[in-house]
């Protein structure tokens, strides 16, 4: 699997999950989130050659098409597969509120 | 929706489904398929700016991150959303066999 265990410990050039830290205030303009100040969101990057963690029958076909037509702009793309939630704390007036934000952290990628 | 109805009738620059015809023999090397000779597989292409058909909470965050950090390599990617099957005919000896290949035709795209 193209997950953090594999990708963070390798120098994989193909589609893999990469490290990305997002600061809520600086990177998103979300000044009102109290905790955390930011988080390891990660992102997916790298080419999707034929047979590399292909998602559907279509992505297999497209990767094969790409092999036969290397100059073509049609190619599978490296995108998130497994996403995890992130708990945040913010204040409504003086009252702290905890919320679980779904699908915020990339754990693995796929070629789609 | 970024589907064939919208995308094929517009000059949309952002993420949209594009026309792509795949010839089984020439483009994939699949000489054994009797019918059809090829099919309109289509593909997804175009940038994924802030708010453009974003798939998950994560893709919204990443698009927003990208707005604040325009030079970053982390950005959502335009990939298939709705896929449709394709019926094919091939021969096993002299006997024709009809098979439904799932997830072969792109009908719409999303930013993931």
């Amino acid at each position: 699997a193209l997950d953090t265990n594999y990708c963070f410990s390798s120098t994989e050039k193909n589609c893999c999950v990469r490290q990305l830290y997002i600061d809520f205030r600086k990177d998103l303009g979300w000044k009102w989130i109290h905790e955390p100040k930011g988080y390891h969101a990660n992102f997916c990057l790298g080419p999707c050659p034929y047979i590399w963690s292909l998602d559907t029958q279509y992505s297999k076909v497209l990767a094969l098409y790409n092999q036969h037509n290397p100059g073509a702009s049609a190619a599978p793309c490296c995108v998130p597969q497994a996403l995890e939630p992130l708990p945040i704390v913010y204040y409504v007036g003086r009252k702290p509120k905890v919320e679980q934000l779904s699908n915020m952290i990339v754990r693995s990628c796929k070629c789609s | 929706a970024l589907d064939t109805n919208y995308c094929f009738s517009s000059t949309e620059k952002n993420c949209c489904v594009r026309q792509l015809y795949i010839d089984f023999r020439k483009d994939l090397g699949w000489k054994w398929i009797h019918e059809p000779k090829g099919y309109h597989a289509n593909f997804c292409l175009g940038p994924c700016p802030y708010i453009w058909s974003l798939d998950t909470q994560y893709s919204k965050v990443l698009a927003l991150y990208n707005q604040h950090n325009p030079g970053a390599s982390a950005a959502p990617c335009c990939v298939p959303q709705a896929l449709e099957p394709l019926p094919i005919v091939y021969y096993v000896g002299r006997k024709p066999k009809v098979e439904q290949l799932s997830n072969m035709i792109v009908r719409s795209c999303k930013c993931s």
Epitope: W32, Y90, Y91, V92, G93, R94 | Y50, K60
Partner: antibody
Framework: EVQLVQSGAEVKKPGASVKVSCKTS????????MNWVRQAPGAGLDWMGQ????????NYNEMFEGRVTLTADTSTSTAYMELSSLRAGDIAVYYC??????????????WGQGTLVTVSS | DIVMTQTPPSLSVSPRETASISCRAS??????????MHWYLQKPGQSPQLLIY???NLESGVSDRFSGSGSGTDFTLRISRVEANDTGVYYC?????????FGQGTK
């Protein structure tokens, strides 16, 4: 230029629901909280609640007894306020107003033009 | 809930004079070194517009004839060299405690 453009005036029967829209432009919709404030004829301002459009988090004023529902469509940068079980006391101008951005509850720096809701049998 | 009381309910001021409006909160609206008190003007037939943010910060684009002061429970909005264009209803608002609340207005 930041703009908040609200839907037109509504006339509703008692017991019915009303849904007011607030189409925004000129700023990043998922960066700011959107508040809803109402003003009865000749009266002051009452805060109804707020929504963070990025993931739909909401905070409501208990005064509205669960009758108000706030939603947002990020694809069109539009916020919505639905008020159910309408009564005569709900006759008011309803405003959407963007939060200032430093806190969830905050000052409001841009306001829609207001939508008059009339309740009449 | 925090109740905001404005005085006077209405005020008539001659051009070029100074006007003062008071707002008292039922409990302190100070937290983390800030006073969570803001001032708005609603001109006839218009939506409210933000004048002062966090008790004393002038909102961008607002005339410097407007100034705010105070802390804790007592706050004041001052309008110097009053103009006819300043006519309307002035509201204070707190956001230190949920629910956010407004004063009843000063005309």
């Amino acid at each position: 230029e930041v703009q908040l453009v609200q839907s037109g005036a509504e006339v509703k029967k008692p017991g019915a629901s009303v849904k007011v829209s607030c189409k925004t432009s000129g700023y990043i919709f998922i960066t700011y909280w959107m508040n809803w404030v109402r003003q009865a004829p000749g009266a002051g301002l009452d805060w109804m609640g707020q929504i963070f459009p990025a993931w739909g988090s909401t905070n409501y004023n208990e005064m509205f007894e669960g009758r108000v529902t706030l939603t947002a469509d990020t694809s069109t940068s539009t916020a919505y306020m639905e008020l159910s079980s309408l009564r005569a006391g709900d006759i008011a101008v309803y405003y959407c107003a963007r939060g200032y951005g430093n806190y969830a509850l905050d000052a409001m720096d841009y306001w829609g033009q207001g939508t008059l809701v009339t309740v009449s049998s | 809930d925090i109740v905001m009381t404005q005085t006077p309910p209405s005020l008539s001021v001659s051009p070029r004079e100074t006007a003062s409006i008071s707002c008292r909160a039922s409990e302190s609206v100070d937290s983390y070194g800030n006073s969570f008190m803001h001032w708005y003007l609603q001109k006839p037939g218009q939506s409210p517009q933000l004048l002062i943010y966090l008790a004393s910060n002038l909102e961008s684009g607002v005339s410097d004839r407007f100034s705010g002061s105070g802390s804790g429970t007592d706050f004041t909005l001052r309008i110097s060299r009053v103009e006819a264009n300043d006519t309307g209803v002035y509201y204070c608002q707190q956001n230190d405690e949920d629910p956010l609340s407004f004063g009843q207005g000063t005309k």
